[in-house]
Interface confidence: medium
Amino acid sequence: EAHKSEIAHRYNDLGEQHFKGLVLIAFSQYLQKCSYDEHAKLVQEVTDFAKTCVADESAANCDKSLHTLFGDKLCAIPNLRENYGELADCCTKQEPERNECFLQHKDDNPSLPPFERPEAEAMCTSFKENPTTFMGHYLHEVARRHPYFYAPELLYYAEQYNEILTQCCAEADKESCLTPKLDGVKEKALVSSVRQRMKCSSMQKFGERAFKAWAVARLSQTFPNADFAEITKLATDLTKVNKECCHGDLLECADDRAELAKYMCENQATISSKLQTCCDKPLLKKAHCLSEVEHDTMPADLPAIAADFVEDQEVCKNYAEAKDVFLGTFLYEYSRRHPDYSVSLLLRLAKKYEATLEKCCAEANPPACYGTVLAEFQPLVEEPKNLVKTNCDLYEKLGEYGFQNAILVRYTQKAPQVSTPTLVEAARNLGRVGTKCCTLPEDQRLPCVEDYLSAILNRVCLLHEKTPVSEHVTKCCSGSLVERRPCFSALTVDETYVPKEFKAETFTFHSDICTLPEKEKQIKKQTALAELVKHKPKATAEQLKTVMDDFAQFLDTCCKAADKDTCFSTEGPNLVTRCKDALA
């Protein structure tokens, strides 16, 4: 139903706390360089205005759209051009072009320093003094670094953060209470960020239809007892929610997500037997819980998929009459039978099925032509299964750090033109798939591995889009989202690459490396490894291992030395000489 004042409607639906949080996230995701104080001031102004509209919906400007209200606020910021350059040109446009312009200027890799966690004492003092300001800082810092973070989910993580601080700040040893718990939240939030970015990429590049197909597959796997009409309804609603969030309409997105959660909990009987635990929780926890609820038990009496989609004499007639619905039912039926497949694989199979019908239904004897389609799925299924087996075996053999290094070598050989920091970030993230997925039961490994890799590779594509340097990467990133991972996996050494000259300073280290946290040390070593591969792209695994072992030994020796600086300055050049010899 239409509301006289959109802002009053959303304020009433969401309540003041969530309203303020979402407005702060929206502003932080649009203007990523502004300080917390600048945004907090704007949020307060918007909230005060919303309250006047709640009191009187026909008050001045209360009938304006949220884009108009928010855009006007952003465009009134002083020194916009000095701080944001051409983004200021957006302010010369009218809605909806102005909002589209803001969206196009979101930066997936803003030049902000890493978000460092304060000392436990500092956090607790700060949190106790003013929990609202503390959580505001958290929302602001995460949102500006992750401009597509799923806003209602970010409110959930802020709530988790809040609960952890409340609990741990009352403990004697705050540090050991906080560290593992906050590390856990951080890890989950980072994965959530890359997954959501993938959804927004799907929406932006391929439109709602592509996202809806993704949603149908995912929901069918999770709710195999729900009928196709129910799955379609849920997929349509979920598509709307994600479209709104990806489009910067965060108040609508959060409101519609709450509605969707409410609907699911009121219709458990026709959706899934596994929802009750989630539905007993408060709003943010409920919606989060529903988004990762375990798969319902598959119906025992499902007929073979071939009956309706291969053996039926009316296949081409059904397809011609309503292509999208017929393909949708195929995707639904195949997905509900295969919770052990990744969504990417299911979409590839649906695509293969569609291509087969397009070809065969135009021929003289269609059944003879499409009769073998299910057999033709076999290589498509085997490829990711082999990928999982090979990579999990390697992970189990090498451990996370060693596995990351193996991936780093592989990807540097595939795309040596890509900047070393991007390669290291990608390899570290890709390498985490082992810890995340390889320890799961067999039937959960494939969906975990492939869908996670796809999300990480989407980030590689987004970063590469900004400064394209590798034809290999451009090729894989230009195709459809579901074909990206197989494309990257199939890449081999880039033969067109001219190796980098050997620069001694790239491999020169100083004693400051000794005091770095373990993660930073690893990054330094991985940076050196990528540079070695760029110098010798065809170096064997054995050669690289020799050099890296020597390097590790050198660091260990010098970091234990009484006079570290002298050790680094005398042993360093020897290490560089040995490296050159080993790779000659």
Partner: nanobody, 124 residues
Framework: EVQLVESGGGLVQAGGSLSLSCAAS????????MGWFRQAPGKEREFLAG????????FYGDSVKGRFTASRDSAKNTVTLEMNSLNPEDTAVYYC?????????????????WGRGTQVTVSS
């Protein structure tokens, strides 16, 4: 908001010492990491030293390690930078800055609030 005012700059002979002070006022001081930076004409702003909110951790830039000492008096809301063995290369405008939180911040972009700076000139 946090307001920061530096004092103690001036002219000093090479090899001499100087003590800079930074007074903070405004929003509660305690959850901030305080940092000292300097900027010479035509050069980038350089991190010198930082003190976490409790004064429990101090950390330094490579160029001043062993010569400069930062400390903090939370009760008086002041931070001090003691500078010894000064040389002409230390000539610059010295800034005090505050970063919300308690991290070991070295990047100027991590700092939310800045003082106006105080000139230090070291003559040979």
């Amino acid at each position: 908001e946090v307001q920061l005012v530096e004092s103690g700059g001036g002219l000093v002979q090479a090899g001499g010492s100087l003590s800079l002070s930074c007074a903070a006022s405004g929003r509660t001081f305690s959850p901030y990491t305080m940092g000292w930076f300097r900027q010479a004409p035509g050069k980038e702003r350089e991190f010198l030293a930082g003190v976490t909110w409790s004064g429990s951790s101090t950390f330094y830039g490579d160029s001043v390690k062993g010569r400069f000492t930062a400390s903090r008096d939370s009760a008086k809301n002041t931070v001090t930078l003691e500078m010894n063995s000064l040389n002409p290369e230390d000539t610059a405008v010295y800034y005090c800055a505050a970063a919300y939180g308690g991290g070991l911040y070295r990047d100027p972009r991590s700092y939310d609030y800045w003082g106006r700076g105080t000139q230090v000139t070291v003559s040979s």
